[in-house]
């Protein structure tokens, strides 16, 4: 056919527009074209021809007479998205073709599942609350709004802001509590999140706080603590940041803490802790328990030779810690601890209150008064100092026979014997766990010979009992453990002296060096029981005022006592041992003075110290279990050097929960010390023990280790 004058090529007069439509919904992409002859219209998506009902009657796309493309329903899956894309319509006639502008068809989408559902929130009133929400994936990107208890929230209220997916309430009130739902919305529709609960609680607050208090011992005291909050706070008390010890405290219904009879150990900081789900508040108050001064160790009368040194102990306790001072009766001069020593003054008071007088003169004789003073009262004690010109000092009392460990039954009778001798004749007193005994208990009496009798035994009588023989020349003590059980013996087994070995003969000195003395002796007289071993005791006025055990488990009748001080007078005695116990002591040796050493040059040669310490050989004896929680450690020393300050007893647990725990130390700070008692051990536990000599920061070689297992119960006699 030939070109007709009125014919003209196609021209698009209505272009399709971008459209966003929901899946499953109908939509139309418009397209109108002019031209003569009337152009045919075809559609292309992403460059490919679009099938319509003209191609396949079952198609969901229809080409309308106008040229528009009508979708019966938008088809759009998780993966296949046949309708989504960029469309153009093309108008054609024999004169040419016209192509429309691109129009994008995007499928609106709003999934069901929220990317983040809000979660329950618990806040304290006044705190901000934040509820977070991420709506389901969607196109266009969904916006959100919030509902509280199914009612849309107005975010114009100044406390409320909605930013991103977050609902923020800046200063929560009780009335903000409720169920919150996040709503995601776009053209597809709306989706509700799972509801989240906002709970608004109130932190604990104090209506009444405890106040600081000062009381006298044995008075009652109350600490008040009143709290409020939601939920109702729990209230508990702590003392010095630890849980309250059981048994001493009463906590009333209103959380008042009451102590019926205060003790000095009750002193400290008491904290009332109020806690609920949203907060914790603490209020504390201090309790000060005033205790009048008491003597822990009283000074005793002493007889001392001229030129010697004497120490009067005066240990006190109380709250506050008493101030201790001394004066000589008839003198206005007061002596205080830590006072700079006056020139030519031979008197000084230690920080613990002991009075020491050096280079004693006849004029020092008299009464010395120790006074202890606090705001809660004052006490004083006198002791007489007698000065003699006797050169050989009298030794402290000797306990011939001391108490034995024993296990006895409830309601039984205990006899703890203590027979002592000495010049002057000693007085015998008893201690239980270090405190004077028997006090006012009518069940306990000290008999004429010094034996302690306790009738109608109770479990609470269990403990360590110490017999103390005291005279002006010193004091000697001997301890034993009494264990009262339901199943023990009813009366103490009273060892006859005939069950024990006889006392050895007077020890003879066979060799003396600056640090050692060699002794020999004979076993007890024929006819007495044999000894399985011996112990050696020594006394030196300048070392201590009591007898010290310097050797244990000695199997021979010749023995060298080592670790002695140079230029020092010692007395020795020996006792025999058999399974039934200890014999009476041998007669005392003659006084023996160890050899002198040339005074060391001023300053210390460190290499010399280290060399000498390295030569010290410490031999550790088998430790002895005294009680389920105490062990006696004894050792001997070969080659005692001049440079030694003491011995470090090291021990650690090797069984139980803290097996191979770190070493614990107990320092025996006297160079001549050869024994130490480890206390506060655990029952039924194995310990490893060793001993190390030291001088200042220098340390010698460790002894070989020994192990010992503490008992579950006290060892019976």
């Amino acid at each position: 056919s030939r070109l007709r004058q009125e014919d003209f090529p196609p021209r698009i007069v209505e272009h399709p527009s971008d459209v966003i439509v929901s899946k499953g919904e109908p939509t139309t992409l418009n397209c109108k074209a002019e031209g003569r002859p009337t152009p045919t219209i075809e559609w292309y998506k992403d460059g490919e021809r679009v099938e319509t009902d003209k191609d396949d009657p079952r198609s969901h796309r229809m080409l309308l007479p106008s040229g528009s493309l009508f979708f019966l329903r938008i088809v759009h899956g998780r993966r296949s998205k046949p309708d989504e894309g960029s469309y153009v319509c093309v108008a054609r006639n024999y004169l040419g073709e016209a192509v429309s502008r691109n129009a994008s068809l995007e499928v609106a989408l709003l999934r069901d599942d929220f990317r983040q559902n809000p979660t329950d929130v618990v806040v304290a009133a006044g705190e901000p609350a934040i509820l977070e929400c991420q709506p389901p994936r969607g196109h266009p990107e969904p916006t959100i709004y919030w509902k509280k208890d199914k009612v849309r929230i107005d975010d114009k209220e100044e406390r409320i802001s909605i930013r991103g997916g977050k609902l923020m309430i800046s200063n929560t009130r009780k009335s903000d509590a409720g169920m919150y739902t996040c709503v995601g919305t776009n053209m597809v529709g709306e989706r509700d999140s799972d509801p989240a609960e906002l709970t608004v609680f109130e932190r604990p607050t104090f209506l009444r706080r405890p106040i600081n208090q000062v009381v006298l011992e044995e008075e009652a005291v109350e600490f008040r603590c009143q709290v409020q909050g939601d939920p109702q706070p729990t209230v508990r008390w702590k003392k010095d940041d630890a849980d309250l010890p059981r048994g001493r405290y009463d906590i009333k219904d209103d959380y008042t803490l009451r102590i019926k009879k205060t003790m000095s150990t009750d002193e400290g900081t008491y904290m009332c802790i109020a806690e609920n789900r949203v907060g914790k508040m603490e209020a504390s108050a201090t309790l000060t328990v005033r205790a009048p001064p008491q003597f822990v160790v009283r000074p005793r009368d002493q007889i001392v030779a001229q030129g010697r040194t004497v120490t009067f102990p005066c240990e006190t306790k109380g709250n506050p810690q008493p101030a201790v001072f001394w004066q000589k009766e008839g003198s206005q001069n007061l002596l205080f601890p830590n006072q700079p020593q006056q020139p030519n003054s031979r008197c000084s008071v230690s920080p613990t209150g002991d009075l020491t007088i050096t280079n004693i003169q006849r004029s020092d004789a008299g009464y010395y008064i120790c006074q202890a003073l606090t705001v809660a009262g004052s006490i004083l004690a006198k002791a007489q100092l007698e000065v003699t010109d006797v050169l050989t000092d009298r030794p402290p009392p000797i306990i011939l026979q001391g108490p034995a460990n024993q296990t006895l039954a409830v309601d039984g009778t205990a006899l703890l014997k203590c027979k002592a001798t000495g010049d002057p004749l000693p007085v015998i007193s008893w201690l239980k766990e270090g405190f004077t005994f028997p006090g006012r208990d009518p069940r306990a009496t000290i008999q004429e010979q010094g034996t302690l009798q306790i009738k109608n035994l109770r479990i609470s009588d269990t403990g360590t009992y110490t017999c103390v023989a005291t005279s002006s020349s010193g004091e000697t003590s001997w301890s034993a453990v009494l264990d009262v059980t339901e199943s023990g013996a009813t009366i103490s087994k009273n060892y006859d002296l005939s069950d024990l070995p006889g006392p050895p003969s007077k020890p003879q000195v066979t060799d003396v060096t600056k640090n050692s003395v060699t002794l020999s002796w004979q076993p007890g007289t024929p006819g007495t029981l044999p000894a399985s071993a011996y112990i050696i005791e020594a006394f030196s006025q300048s070392v201590s005022n009591s007898w010290q055990t310097v050797a244990n488990h000695v199997k021979t009748t010749l023995y060298t006592v080592r670790g002695l001080r140079p230029n020092t007078i010692y007395l020795f005695m020996v006792r025999a041992i058999n399974p039934q116990g200890l014999s009476d002591p041998s007669p005392m040796s003659d006084p023996v003075r160890t050899q002198d050493i040339s005074p060391p040059a001023q300053g210390v040669d460190h290499r010399q110290v280290q060399k000498e310490l390295g030569d010290v050989l410490v031999r550790l004896h088998n430790p002895v279990v005294l009680t389920p929680t105490t062990v006696q450690v004894t050792w001997t020393v070969d080659r005692q050097p001049q440079f030694i300050q003491g011995y470090r007893v090291m021990y650690r647990q090797t069984s139980g929960l803290q097996a191979t725990s770190s070493w614990q130390n107990l320092d025996a700070k006297v160079p001549t010390e050869r024994s130490a008692v480890l206390v506060n051990l655990k029952k039924g536990v194995t310990y490893e023990i060793k001993v190390r000599p030291y001088f200042n920061e220098f340390q010698g070689m460790d002894s070989e280790s020994k192990t010992v297992r503490t008992t579950e119960e006290a060892p019976s006699a």
Epitope: K45, E48, E51, V75, G77, R79, S80, K81, P82, D113
Partner: antibody, heavy 118, light 105 residues
Amino acid sequence: EVQLVQSGAEVKKPGASVKVSCKASGYTFTGYYMHWVRQAPGQGLEWMGWINPKNGDTEFPQKFQGRVTMTRDTSITTAYMELSRLRSDDTAVYYCARESGDDAFDIWGQGTMVTVSS
Amino acid sequence: DIQMTQSPSSLSASVGDRVTITCRASQSISSYLNWYQQKPGKAPKLLIYAASSLQSGVPSRFSGSGSGTDFTLTISSLQPEDFATYYCQQSVGLFFGGGTKVEIK
């Protein structure tokens, strides 16, 4: 008419590879994902993976990863599935299937029998 | 992967019977579940998509229900041409159930 026509039956030796074709017609080839499903004799249907004809993206279950390759040629609207290192238990009928916009396999090929035998 | 468990694996029924086949997903798949019918020697045919939507051209005696993890295909009155094997398929991960063979009693 919308249809999928697959290539003919194949007999292969163990260790060899097989390539099955699937010719699509009657619809916009690039608008719909193409899947492959197989069925061993007397057994159920086992999905092997898909290809997006628009861009060639593929996805396979763990079981077939490394052994299956899916390709397409948009110019001739044909999808291909190649299975390598064949074993006797790969003997099955292999189907291609179009995934509709409703997330279901609405059009299936007639199936291709692949026999692996030494 | 989400596993699909179909039950029973086979059943015998008579023409006119109401037949129910169940399919359980190992975790929630919302409504992304399809049902297919397959006759021996033939390719499978789509019956139900999106758990309950009937594919065009499929008789109305077929219906689907369920969402989340438990789904059911029901044939309200079994016809002779309905004896076949039926498969469920989840369209999240595209795995099929083990199939249920419906045989003539």
